[in-house]
Interface confidence: low
């Protein structure tokens, strides 16, 4: 039942154009180009996309026409390499154009920048946006795709089409509402937050495939799909995993047309076979394509079948364990992971993968021993501490979150992580710690049975952000070690890091702690970021500062900002009171 075995097509570009339709074809080519050439102006990309689209239409009309038999990588790569300013804008990325496929595409992929030097997206006034939307809806929506894709070069392309559809719906509805802003702004905020989360989740999938290989991604998919579809047979889950792996490999590899096409096929297959997959799919399968695929990806876990037998019989007590393992190691381990995961929707995927790794290690050792059964008989005893560690950590941190609230919980994490890895840049520490802190409001509200999958799998996504940002400019051996040694042990590795005793404190620079009246006009979120940036810098100057010392300084700082923002002459207040604050802080911290 291989969904993706297709007849060979004379023209790949014509085949994808016909499968996807013109609108999706153009949108996906725009996303692909913007994710590769992140600095190019919008107009240049639109021109390239139009040229590719016109060419695709000639191939639809006649698949034997000149160049229609070329691969998509060749066609798109040739098009990207026509950009006149490639060397000036992208430097050594221009050298990719001297290579042949498939090396050229690999070269473009390696130059994708997770933190491109682009201005922050500033949201215009609602009336300005509505006018732009009405004046030229098509350009307005293309601009959205372009701006998101260039800032998130691994965004899951078919999902970005779904976001664009919701973006369009928001403007269509709200630009004719009585109170446009009240209607539109909450919708845009929701799309922004969901978009960031979607981007980060996909970035982890791509990192998993690119840094740890297909086997690692498939193991993740077996565990997650087994939790989600516990009634499905192992063969069914394996088939879904194979197809899902192909979809994500394509999207992470820049093959966005194939990825979107194959994702649609997978959604179709799931809906046609929902009886043997899950009872929760009915509503999803009644939706249009983009909504359907999104809905399936987010669908709740099905109920566990009643009376599942004990795992011990097949995986510990059976005399055939080593025989079964030797015959087909990955299949046997896949069955173990499937059986364990479908019984444990209360575990995080990374925990399930740790258990499977422990089981694999034990079998590797024991199946070579004199008495294998005696050796692996107590392997399940090994699991208890692995399970308890995240349970305890989540319990402690949720208690701390409930005690402090989100902002102060983020601050506690900022201090904790700055002390662990003080070499990491301040903006990265602030961004990552703020996101780590969001685990509280996201997961601590859940009952015990849902806390661990929510929290630990979310933390894996956030720590991957740290890993990809750090990989661009590596500054800490400890971060590199935690990021590269084991995908599933990243979180325990970071949790285990103590204060970095080798760190030489940063020289004190009063400029870092000089603030101006512009802070008063910032939003609450931006003001928090300013204060948290100062907190990180304080810890970098004085890594041995106690919680009490840091709290005292931060309280003084908050009072100083509040006082000066109420003053008549704000700038003078910031200048004079700021000097006093810096002196008092230096004294308090013994700087």
């Amino acid at each position: 039942r291989g969904v993706f075995r297709r007849d060979a097509h004379k023209s790949e570009v014509a085949h994808r154009f016909k499968d996807l339709g013109e609108e999706n074809f153009k949108a996906l080519v725009l996303i692909a180009f913007a994710q590769y050439l992140q600095q190019c102006p919008f107009e240049d990309h639109v021109k390239l996309v139009n040229e590719v689209t016109e060419f695709a239409k000639t191939c639809v009309a006649d698949e034997s026409a000149e160049n229609c038999d070329k691969s998509l990588h060749t066609l798109f790569g040739d098009k990207l390499c026509t950009v006149a300013t490639l060397r000036e804008t992208y430097g050594e990325m221009a050298d990719c154009c001297a290579k042949q496929e498939p090396e050229r595409n690999e070269c473009f992929l390696q130059h994708k920048d997770d933190n491109p030097n682009l201005p922050r997206l500033v949201r215009p006034e609602v009336d300005v946006m509505c006018t732009a939307f009405h004046d030229n809806e098509e350009t307005f929506l293309k601009k959205y795709l372009y701006e998101i894709a260039r800032r998130h070069p691994y965004f899951y392309a078919p999902e970005l089409l779904f976001f664009a559809k919701r973006y369009k719906a928001a403007f269509t509805e709200c630009c004719q509402a009585a109170d446009k802003a009240a209607c539109l702004l909450p919708k845009l905020d929701e799309l922004r937050d969901e978009g960031k989360a979607s981007s980060a989740k996909q970035r982890l999938k791509c990192a998993s495939l690119q840094k740890f290989g297909e086997r690692a991604f498939k193991a993740w998919a077996v565990a997650r799909l087994s939790q989600r579809f516990p009634k499905a047979e192992f063969a069914e889950v394996s088939k879904l995993v194979t197809d899902l792996t192909k979809v994500h490999t394509e999207c992470c590899h820049g093959d966005l047309l194939e990825c979107a096409d194959d994702r649609a096929d997978l959604a179709k297959y799931i809906c046609e076979n929902q009886d043997s997959i899950s009872s929760k799919l009915k509503e999803c399968c009644e939706k249009p394509l983009l909504e359907k695929s999104h809905c399936i990806a987010e669908v709740e876990n099905d109920e566990m079948p009643a009376d599942l037998p004990s795992l011990a019989a097949d995986f510990v007590e059976s005399k055939d364990v080593c025989k079964n393992y030797a015959e087909a190691k990955d299949v046997f381990l896949g069955m173990f992971l499937y059986e364990y995961a479908r019984r444990h929707p209360d575990y995080s995927v990374v925990l399930l993968l740790r258990l499977a790794k422990t089981y694999e290690t034990t079998l590797e050792k024991c199946c070579a021993a004199a008495d294998p059964h005696e050796c692996y008989a107590k392997v399940f005893d090994e699991f208890k501490p692995l399970v308890e560690e995240p349970q305890n950590l989540i319990k402690q941190n949720c208690e701390l979150f409930e005690q402090l609230g989100e902002y102060k919980f983020q601050n506690a994490l900022l201090v904790r992580y700055t002390k662990k890895v003080p070499q990491v840049s301040t903006p990265t520490l602030v961004e990552v710690s703020r996101n780590l802190g969001k685990v509280g409001s996201k997961c601590c509200k859940h009952p015990e049975a849902k806390r661990m999958p929510c929290a630990e799998d979310y933390l894996s996504v956030v720590l991957n952000q740290l890993c990809v940002l750090h990989e661009k400019t590596p500054v800490s051996d400890r971060v590199t070690k935690c990021c590269t040694e084991s995908l599933v042990n990243r979180r325990p590795c970071f949790s285990a890091l103590e204060v970095d005793e080798t760190y030489v404190p940063k020289e004190f620079n009063a400029e870092t702690f000089t603030f101006h009246a512009d802070i008063c006009t910032l939003s609450e979120k931006e003001r928090q970021i300013k204060k948290q940036t100062a907190l990180v810098e304080l810890v970098k100057h004085k890594p041995k500062a106690t919680k009490e010392q840091l709290k005292a300084v931060m309280d003084d700082f908050a009072a100083f900002v509040e006082k000066c923002c109420k003053a008549d002459d704000k700038e003078t207040c910031f200048a004079e009171e700021g000097k006093k604050l810096v002196a008092a802080s230096q004294a308090a911290l013994g700087l």
Partner: nanobody, 126 residues
Framework: EVQLLESGGGLVQPGGSLRLSCAAS????????VAWFRQAPGKEREFVAG????????YYADSVKGRFTISRDNSKNTLYLQMNSLRPEDTAVYYC???????????????????WGQGTLVTVSS
């Protein structure tokens, strides 16, 4: 290769205390999962307490929880077992075991520990 050498055993009255030490050489003790096991005459070797490699998460057998404390001093490359409120049933030879490769969690399965000390005898009797 890891060498382990236990010390601190002896005769003690019920309710008394002892502190066992295990000096490691050949590898840093914080890079290994380390544990204490014990074997009473005519009985199987059993897990007493363990501590993960690279992370100070500790585990105890139910029979010793609240009475025994495992710890390590990385600067001295030494593992300790503080035993309070000793009972006659704690009488056994106590072994220190190490499992390198920095496992984050210690194992309670003796077979998974490749390195063992010679053992030190603890006798609890009046």
């Amino acid at each position: 290769e890891v060498q382990l050498l236990e010390s601190g055993g002896g005769l003690v009255q019920p309710g008394g205390s002892l502190r066992l030490s295990c000096a490691a050489s050949g590898r840093y003790i914080d890079e290994t999962a380390v544990a204490w096991f014990r074997q009473a005459p005519g009985k199987e070797r059993e897990f007493v307490a363990g501590i993960g490699g690279g992370v100070d998460i500790t585990y105890y057998a139910d029979s010793v929880k609240g009475r025994f404390t495992i710890s390590r001093d990385n600067s001295k490359n030494t593992l300790y077992l503080q035993m309070n409120s000793l009972r006659p049933e704690d009488t056994a030879v106590y072994y220190c075991a190490a499992r390198p490769g920095k496992p984050l969690i210690t194992s309670k399965v003796a077979d998974l520990y490749p390195y063992w000390g010679q053992g030190t005898l603890v006798t609890v009797s009046s």
